[in-house]
């Protein structure tokens, strides 16, 4: 199904405008900001979601050590350019002609430059590390139960194939979820780990992107799991290119 037929809404993306003007009077939904048609049976790409967010009213808004090449999204929100498939274009520029290269999750991976900056290809983010700290509880969660619950969540809520959840680490109060998805592993129809991570991030912040679906209520054997901070690290198939001055 492309959208909920009975009341013509998009279950997987509330930032859409839907109408029964598809083939045969079918419900068709378009993303705010870009006007691109979206498939409401799966997650919408992060690029289209960011674009929609920027067009919306402003108020609508053993542990692994990340490698030296891991990126954190320090730049925050921007109005991205998306390709016809809804993916980030490799080169992004702002209104003042400042340009930079991004990876497949839209995070900057080069220094900023001018309009002459070249970004030859969209580099794939193949490994995402989601680092969470949960609020204090009476005791630690059972690791196996926590692990299974988070894997279930990514399967059921985000439709991410279980093979892409590489590991769940837990050292109270820190939880780390590792998502891995190489270009060769991703088949047609598979949810992208970057999109799943973005939906999860928004859910954790209480800003669910789902339509008519309750907010995220994470429980482990009935015990609420409340997250107090989230950090997401992105690792690309090709390491980022920053000059030394950025590191000082």
């Amino acid at each position: 199904h492309t959208a909920a037929q009975d009341n013509c809404t998009c279950p997987t993306n509330k930032m859409t405008v839907c109408s029964p003007d598809g083939p045969g009077g079918r419900c068709q939904c378009r993303a705010l900001g870009s006007g691109m048609a979206v498939d409401c049976s799966t997650l919408t790409s992060k690029c289209l979601l960011l674009k929609a967010r920027m067009s919306a009213p402003k108020n609508a808004r053993t542990l692994v050590r990340p490698s030296e090449h891991a990126l954190v999204d320090n730049d925050g929100l921007y109005d991205p350019d998306c390709d016809p498939e809804g993916r980030f274009k490799a080169r992004q520029c702002n209104q003042t002609s400042v340009c930079w290269c991004v990876n497949s999750v839209g995070v900057r991976r080069t220094d900023k430059g001018d309009l002459s900056l070249r970004c030859d290809e969209l580099v794939r983010t193949h490994h995402i590390l989601i680092d969470l700290r949960h609020r204090p509880t009476a005791g630690a969660f059972n690791h196996s139960d926590l692990d299974a619950e988070l894997r279930r969540l990514f399967r059921e809520r985000y439709r991410l194939h279980p093979k892409f959840v590489a590991a769940v680490h837990y050292e109270q109060p820190t939880i780390q979820i590792e998502l891995r998805q190489n270009t060769s592993q991703k088949a047609a129809g598979d949810v992208d780990i970057g999109d799943a991570a973005y939906y999860f991030e928004r859910d954790i912040k209480g800003e669910s992107l789902f339509q008519g679906r309750g907010g995220l209520d994470l429980r482990v054997r009935g015990e609420p799991l409340q997250v107090e901070r989230t950090l997401i690290y992105y690792l690309d198939e090709i390491p980022p290119k920053f000059s030394m001055k950025r590191l000082t």
Epitope: H1, S41, R151, E156, R159, L160, H161, P162, G214
Partner: antibody, heavy 117, light 106 residues
Framework: QVQLQQSGPELVKPGASVKMSCKAS????????IGWVKQRTGQGLEWIGE????????YYTEKFKGKATLTADTSSNTAYMQLSSLTSEDSAVYFC??????????WGQGTTLTVSS | QIVLTQSPAIMSASPGEKVTMTCSAS?????MYWYQQKPGSSPRLLIY???TLASGVPVRFSGSGSGTSYSLTISRMEAEDAATYYC?????????FGGGTKLEIK
Amino acid sequence: QVQLQQSGPELVKPGASVKMSCKASGFTFTDYVIGWVKQRTGQGLEWIGEIYLGSGTIYYTEKFKGKATLTADTSSNTAYMQLSSLTSEDSAVYFCARGSIFPFDYWGQGTTLTVSS
Amino acid sequence: QIVLTQSPAIMSASPGEKVTMTCSASSSVSYMYWYQQKPGSSPRLLIYDTSTLASGVPVRFSGSGSGTSYSLTISRMEAEDAATYYCQQWSSYPYTFGGGTKLEIK
């Protein structure tokens, strides 16, 4: 094509244990999840638990903690369920089923367990 | 845990007749799944994500609903549809099934 072949019927005495198998073919074993479901004669379906084959992560429903033990041998593409301290209440057909982005998309043919003295 | 209640428990229909069965959840679920089971066989996935037909399922089957109320409809009953139908949720652990609706042919 995807197939889940379960082991044959078992007749065991009360108090004993039994280990049944579910041999998978037609897909990459470690990419998926195997769930187990109980069905007593003339009754409905009852979920027991599941095992993530790539990581070995296991979840049991509260009722089957201590009763069922789920394991998998990735070298032979086989999932196992052991049931211990058997009573007549454990007499049932037990199904294994594959999980992906669906809870159960393919099912085995079932293993009939009879507990009788 | 989320309890799923199916009704009716048993029903019968004549060939060509429209059939509707329901599944009520004790608390809201995101999607409902439906399985068909014939005597001596294992269950078969019929409908996923509330309304999407699984591969090979005839178009006379349809599913609908949201929140706590879901239904399965067969537009025109056929003899081969005589079976027991189970609804199932996985919005939270433990996964649960409804008690089943046994559909007989008149």
